[in-house]
């Protein structure tokens, strides 16, 4: 059993998130993460999950009766959705804390608005390498 | 020229995005889209970089001078990330939506933990077609 | 400060096996990712092991096939690496390296710092 | 493979600049982050340049690193060059199965 399940029940039992009434009025990511099948499809929502999680036990962090869960969670997060590779998960901490009130970050993130909309789309990205047009090909049918 | 290439200029013209200190201190978005190339990665980081757009438009819906600008892109994200697949969209802004300081979204959460984590590595998805079978292969010694 | 003291080490005839220790003070070892490298006489740097720290991933060089195994007792603050069906080749000075907080909570930089080895050398 | 590629050896005099470079093989450069360490004779290996472009506290900022993404290289400069310099350099990073690769290290002579 990998080691997360133990810590997501030490989890439950700190949230009282085992009790029965908690189910009511459907589930708030399962039954997206059902809908969607194509790993880039999954990706996008997956992301925003993750960063929900991160915000959740950043807001906990400081609290000793489950520190070492939420650390174990982190790094099985980190495994899982990052594979591991601490650039990836350090970008994506970037992006997750600018924040969106500051003048500064709106102004260059207007600047930017061109050539991320620009590369948005997955046909968007020119002179890529043959492995990226051999996947674009693969899932042109799906 | 994509319509929202004439709407972003007039956003750069309201937040003055377009003076030459914006660039100052390396960017926001794009030198972290230039780490990622692999369409599964790509889409990670664009989640988040689309819901801080979206969170930023969302501050000033209100404001006559850039509705139309704000609603053409919000539109073109539509058509280019979300494929103009309105569930796609919807499911998006259902997870963005969700309050971390909430504590029945917080129960919900941790109550959903073990499943959201077992599905977060391609390798966890069970029934996919051979392509996933192959990732599992190469990642069979971890 | 932080320390990583490496041993067990020696010789060993081919088709022996050995188990080497790396002894860590100085930070909190139960948070950090874990590596072994090694290097031949005369020869560059090796990879060979690493291992999470709190969710017990293990990562192997494709070279050794499966003749190795990395554990931790995060209680004694210890890194070990079960060598068997050693050969000549696995001659090396093996190193024990600290890598990064894998949670993310005080990430740390990965290889930052090294014990001073311990050599095993694989003789008939 | 994954290999990163670095030149055998480079030599030059005291007060010059070099450059090693370490191209990857497969994967992008870009995606993973790029380590260097110096290792002189007997020693043992000590990081001179961290997550691509940074310096940990103590190496002298004659000490730089970068990443060229048209090449699909890391490179580490050294100005300035010293005699203290004359040392192995390896690069290191990772794969997509989160192995650690090492470059075949560089030998940095100081000329005399």
């Known amino acids: 059993q990998d080691p997360y399940v133990k810590e997501a029940e030490n989890l439950k039992k700190y949230f009282n998130a085992g009790d029965p009434d908690v189910a009511d009025n459907g589930t708030l990511f399962l039954d997206i993460l059902r809908n969607w099948k194509e790993e880039s499809d999954r990706k996008i929502m997956q992301s925003q999950i993750v960063s929900f999680y991160f915000k959740l036990f950043k807001n906990f962090k400081d609290d000793q009766r489950i520190q070492k869960s939420v650390e174990t969670i982190k790094e099985d997060i980190n495994v899982k959705f990052f594979n591991s590779n601490k650039k990836k998960r350090d970008d994506f901490e970037k992006l997750t804390n600018y924040s969106v009130t500051d003048s500064n970050v709106q102004r260059k993130a207007v600047h930017e608005l061109i050539q991320v909309m620009a590369e948005l789309s997955p046909a968007a990205k020119i002179g890529k390498r043959k492995r990226s047009q051999m996947f674009r090909g693969r899932r042109a049918s799906q | 020229q994509d319509p929202y290439v004439k709407e972003a200029e007039n956003l750069k013209k309201y937040f003055n995005a377009g003076d030459p200190d914006v660039a100052d201190n390396g960017t926001l978005f794009l030198d972290i889209l230039r780490n990622w190339k692999e369409e599964s990665d790509r889409k990670i980081m664009q989640s988040q970089i689309v819901s801080f757009y979206f969170k930023l438009f969302k501050n000033f819906k209100d404001d006559q001078r850039i509705q139309k600008s704000v609603e053409t892109i919000k539109e073109d994200i539509n058509v280019k990330f979300f494929n103009s697949n309105k569930k796609k969209r919807d499911d998006f802004e259902k997870l963005t939506n969700y309050s971390v300081t909430d504590s029945n979204v917080q129960r919900k959460a941790v109550h959903e933990l073990i499943q959201v984590m077992a599905e977060l590595s391609p390798a966890a998805k069970i029934g996919k077609r051979k392509r996933s079978q192959m990732f599992r292969g190469r990642r069979a010694s971890q | 400060e932080v320390q990583l003291v490496e041993s067990g080490g020696g010789l060993v005839k081919p088709g022996g096996s050995l188990r080497l220790s790396c002894a860590a003070s100085?930070?909190?070892?139960?948070?950090?990712?874990m590596h072994w490298v090694r290097q031949a006489p005369g020869k560059g740097l090796e990879w060979v092991s690493s291992m999470t720290s709190r969710t017990n991933h293990k990562y192997y060089a494709d070279s050794l096939k499966g003749r190795f195994l990395i554990s931790r007792d995060n209680d004694r603050d210890s890194l070990y690496l079960e060598m068997n069906s050693l050969g000549v080749e696995d001659t090396a000075i093996y190193f024990c390296?600290?890598?990064?907080?894998?949670?993310?909570?005080?990430?740390?930089?990965?290889?930052?710092?090294w014990g001073q080895g311990t050599l095993v050398t694989v003789s008939s | 493979n994954f290999m990163l590629t670095q030149p055998h050896s480079v030599s030059e005099s005291p007060g010059k600049t070099i450059t090693i470079s370490c191209t990857r093989g497969r994967g992008y450069i870009a995606s993973y982050y790029v380590q260097w360490y110096q290792q002189r004779p007997g020693g043992v290996p000590k990081i001179v340049v961290f997550e691509d472009t940074q310096r940990p506290s103590g190496v002298p900022d004659r000490i730089s690193g970068s990443i060229d993404t048209s090449t699909n290289s890391a490179s580490l400069t050294i100005s300035g060059l010293q005699t203290e310099d004359e040392a192995d350099y390896y690069c290191?990073?990772?794969?997509?199965?989160?192995?650690?690769?090492f470059g075949g290290g560089t030998k940095l002579t100081v000329l005399g």
């Open positions: 390296a600290r890598g990064y907080d894998t949670s993310g909570s005080d990430s740390g930089v990965d290889f930052q710092y």
């Open positions: 290191q990073s990772y794969d997509d199965a989160n192995h650690v690769i």
């Open positions: 100085g930070f909190p070892f139960s948070r950090y990712s």
